[in-house]
């Protein structure tokens, strides 16, 4: 089938990184520069990407792939193949319509980018709050308020019940 | 082919003012949404300021009720007005199209000048 194919076309023997040539009876030639050809049988090279602005190159063109960017730092990629860079924000903030603002009381950001979430709700897990939240951390859950009555202790777990020769250290 | 060309840099004393232009060819300017960056010596790239092709604009914590940011299509150029320049505003300045209307965000299709440099000193 391979072979039938070439006969019927002789642009399938073009390898990548070259472009069938109609203008010189079908010939393979290379990929002229600043383009590129990922596959065989090619008719065209594609433009290589540009990392321009707050882009910059992670990746080179080349004859056969095209050139990859990431970001410049304090931005970060978003979007498939890096489309887009936004800027980050500290901790503590998300990134707004008017810039980075400060997380509200009662959500927090651990990250320079993506949203404030708020904090977990400790008694709906039936647990108490361990370490109050911030801006930048969630509150950490505790023991269930039962659990801290006279005597236990918050910090190791009763023994297993099922473990009668254990004791707590 | 698109082209931004930024013109007005300069060394200027603190407490001065400055206005940058952007000579914007090659595309629908009036339609297009506007923006200036800025990378100071040694560090990364600040989003400063942006403006969409109605008017509305948008700045960066840093240079409100200091810089503005305007548009006269009829010129196809871009402007941004620096007063009370402080040292920390010593940057390279660069003018580029603003596709994603999201502050901060720029998109691979966007365009950018080569920039002017501003510095503040005494």
């Known amino acids: 089938f391979e072979r039938t194919r070439s006969l019927q076309d002789p642009c399938s023997n073009c390898p990548a990184g070259t472009f069938c040539d109609n203008n010189r009876n079908q010939i393979c030639s290379p990929c002229p520069p600043n383009s590129f050809s990922s596959a065989g049988g090619q008719r065209t090279c594609d433009i290589c990407r540009q990392c321009k602005g707050v882009f910059r190159t992670r990746k080179e063109c080349s004859s056969t792939s095209n050139a990859e960017c990431d970001c410049t730092p304090g931005f970060h990629c978003l979007g498939a193949g890096c489309s887009m860079c936004e800027q980050d924000c500290k901790q503590g903030q998300e990134l707004t319509k008017k810039g980075c603002k400060d997380c509200c009381f009662g959500t927090f950001n651990d990250q320079k980018r993506g949203i404030c979430r708020p904090w977990t709700n400790c008694s709906l897990d039936g647990k108490s709050v361990l370490v109050n939240g911030t801006k930048e951390r969630d509150v950490v859950c505790g023991p269930s308020p039962a659990d801290l009555s006279p005597g236990a202790s918050s910090v190791t777990p009763p023994a297993p019940a099922r473990e009668p020769g254990h004791s707590p250290q | 082919e698109v082209q931004l060309v930024e013109s007005g840099g300069g060394l200027v004393q603190p407490g001065g003012s400055l206005r940058l232009s952007c000579a914007a060819s090659?595309?629908?300017?009036?339609?297009?949404?506007m923006s200036w960056a800025r990378q100071a010596p040694g560090k990364g790239l600040e989003w400063v300021s942006g403006?969409?092709?109605?008017?509305?604009?948008y700045y960066t914590e840093s240079v409100k009720d200091r810089f503005t940011i305007s548009r006269d299509n009829a010129k196809n150029t871009l402007y941004l007005q620096m007063n009370s320049l402080r040292p920390e505003d010593t940057a390279v300045y660069y003018c580029?199209?603003?596709?994603?209307?999201?502050?901060?965000?720029?998109?691979?299709?966007?365009?950018w000048g080569q920039g002017t440099l501003v510095t503040v000193s005494s």
């Open positions: 580029a199209t603003w596709g994603t209307l999201r502050f901060g965000v720029w998109a691979e299709y966007d365009h």
């Open positions: 090659g595309f629908t300017f009036s339609s297009s949404a």
């Open positions: 403006i969409y092709s109605g008017g509305s604009t």
